[in-house]
Interface confidence: medium
Amino acid sequence: EAYKSEIAHRYNDLGEEHFRGLVLVAFSQYLQQCPFEDHVKLAKEVTEFAKACAAEESGANCDKSLHTLFGDKLCTVASLRDKYGDMADCCEKQEPDRNECFLAHKDDNPGFPPLVAPEPDALCAAFQDNEQLFLGKYLYEIARRHPYFYAPELLYYAQQYKGVFAECCQAADKAACLGPKIEALREKVLLSSAKERFKCASLQKFGDRAFKAWSVARLSQRFPKADFAEISKVVTDLTKVHKECCHGDLLECADDRADLAKYMCENQDSISTKLKECCDKPVLEKSQCLAEVERDELPGDLPSLAADFVEDKEVCKNYQEAKDVFLGTFLYEYARRHPEYSVSLLLRLAKEYEATLEKCCATDDPPTCYAKVLDEFKPLVDEPQNLVKTNCELFEKLGEYGFQNALLVRYTKKAPQVSTPTLVEVSRKLGKVGTKCCKKPESERMSCAEDFLSVVLNRLCVLHEKTPVSERVTKCCSESLVNRRPCFSGLEVDETYVPKEFNAETFTFHADLCTLPEAEKQVKKQTALVELLKHKPKATDEQLKTVMGDFGAFVEKCCAAENKEGCFSEEGPKLVAAAQAALV
């Protein structure tokens, strides 16, 4: 249905509050360096304009596309050239090229300092003084740090954030109430950001087909009672929603997401028995609840896969006349029967099945050729199972910090050219897989671990793409989305790497280290570990363990000393010399 005014249509559909929030998020994701006040002003002006168009659809400029209206607004920002350099050149272009240009300038690593919460009393005062501004600042700070954050989900988290303050600002001990709740929300927000970045990368780098395949597998696991037609319908709609959000079309994205939630709730009977509770909630909570809903039980009478995909004499006809539909059915049937498999594994199996049919359907006797195809899946299934088992055993032995360090060593040896901050960030996140997944029952471990690893490795790929330094990282990132993790797992030590020159400055520490929170202290130590490996890539695990032990003791000793700075400047060089000698 065509609307006279697109902006009025979205304003009416979303309501003023959500509309304003989404516009603020959109601008903050495009112009990440602009101060909050500027974005509030822009969002207010756009919302006022939308309101006027809703009242009179044939008003001046109301018929313009959202990209045109938003782009024109962004291009009025006076400091565009100073703050963003060549991004200002986007403003010379016409739509749709101008929007594509803005998207290309989104910075996945803007380098803003981590958000540090002020004192609880100050926070509560700000919250009570102007709730709308307080939540707007939250949207802005998250959006500018995460330019691909899933906007409707960010509105949901802002609502959660509001709930935390509404509750905790009434509490006797505000700090004790706020601390754990804000931290739990922070973890969820970071994971949500990484998951959406993975979805956007799937769409942008590998296309709709890859994203749809991923979604078919995931939703078939979650809704095994739904038939393929129903799964396909939801996947098609979901693809549109994520394409819009990844493309910066946040108003359309949020509106379509609400429509999808409405459709799912109206068709619960043919999707899942688990949707009822979600469907009684208001729109933001409803969509979030549906996205996180627990898996439905498997239907009890599922026939053998072999009947349809191996034993049937028409397999090649079915495949050749409608390849994607046939493979989609295979993926659906396999996924609904295997909720314990990771999505990545299911996609590898579908790929293997496709390759087998491509080969066999060209032979004189296809049925004999593909007769054992399902048995050939075994090594593909065994590989992630063994990987999870081995790594969870290591995690249980070393704990999270020790496991992160083991991964740090592993990944620095695989790709020593990658920047130290990136190696530290990614290895720390990879290490969290242990905490997140290893305590789960066997039936959930692989799915939890491998799909989480895919999301974290995507972060490595995104950061590496900005400044490519390692051909092997580029290769693993770009060749196949579903084989990224096995590709990284399979990388051996990079023997071509020329060790980095020793730089004493890298290993110089100061008393400020002592007052850092534990997590930041760990980052400092892990940074030193990576630098050490870049200097001495042939160091053995034993040697590294000794040096890191000495380093830990040195930090502990100096932080307990009367004259901390003096201790660091005197003992530091001795430690470095001892480390160099130990690593010869």
Epitope: A229, S232, A307, F309, A322, G328, T329
Partner: nanobody, 126 residues
Framework: EVQLLESGGGLVQPGGSLRLSCAAS????????VAWFRQAPGKGREFVAG????????YYADSVKGRFTISRDNSKNTLYLQMNSLRPEDTAVYYC???????????????????WGQGTLVTVSS
């Protein structure tokens, strides 16, 4: 729940024609694999013709190829079987079956079709 209702059967002379219909409710007929089977007295249910959902891939048993045509009208949510050059050995009760969730016919095995109509009798005799 899917309901299927066949009609169009009857008595016809050898060489004659009939058109069977199968009206579906509870699921769109273009979203699911549908097929015609037949069962002669004292015999098992035998595949006659099928059509894939979403993609119009058609399938025929060797014994009916060139004589029977399967088709569907999505707007009426109805499946058809046009039967020409009928022979006495075509005498049977004709059933339509569907497999929701399967966009393609991937089987000629009756057991794999969970939903059936009640059947319509076709008698070919002079």
């Amino acid at each position: 729940e899917v309901q299927l209702l066949e009609s169009g059967g009857g008595l016809v002379q050898p060489g004659g024609s009939l058109r069977l219909s199968c009206a579906a409710s509870g699921r769109y007929i273009d979203e699911t694999a549908v097929a015609w089977f037949r069962q002669a007295p004292g015999k098992g249910r035998e595949f006659v013709a099928g059509i894939g959902g979403g993609v119009d891939i058609t399938y025929y048993a060797d014994s009916v190829k060139g004589r029977f045509t399967i088709s569907r009208d999505n707007s009426k949510n109805t499946l058809y079987l046009q039967m020409n050059s009928l022979r006495p050995e075509d005498t049977a009760v004709y059933y339509c079956g569907t497999r929701p969730g399967r966009p393609l016919i991937t089987s000629k095995v009756a057991d794999l079709y969970p939903y059936w109509g009640q059947g319509t009798l076709v008698t070919v005799s002079s």
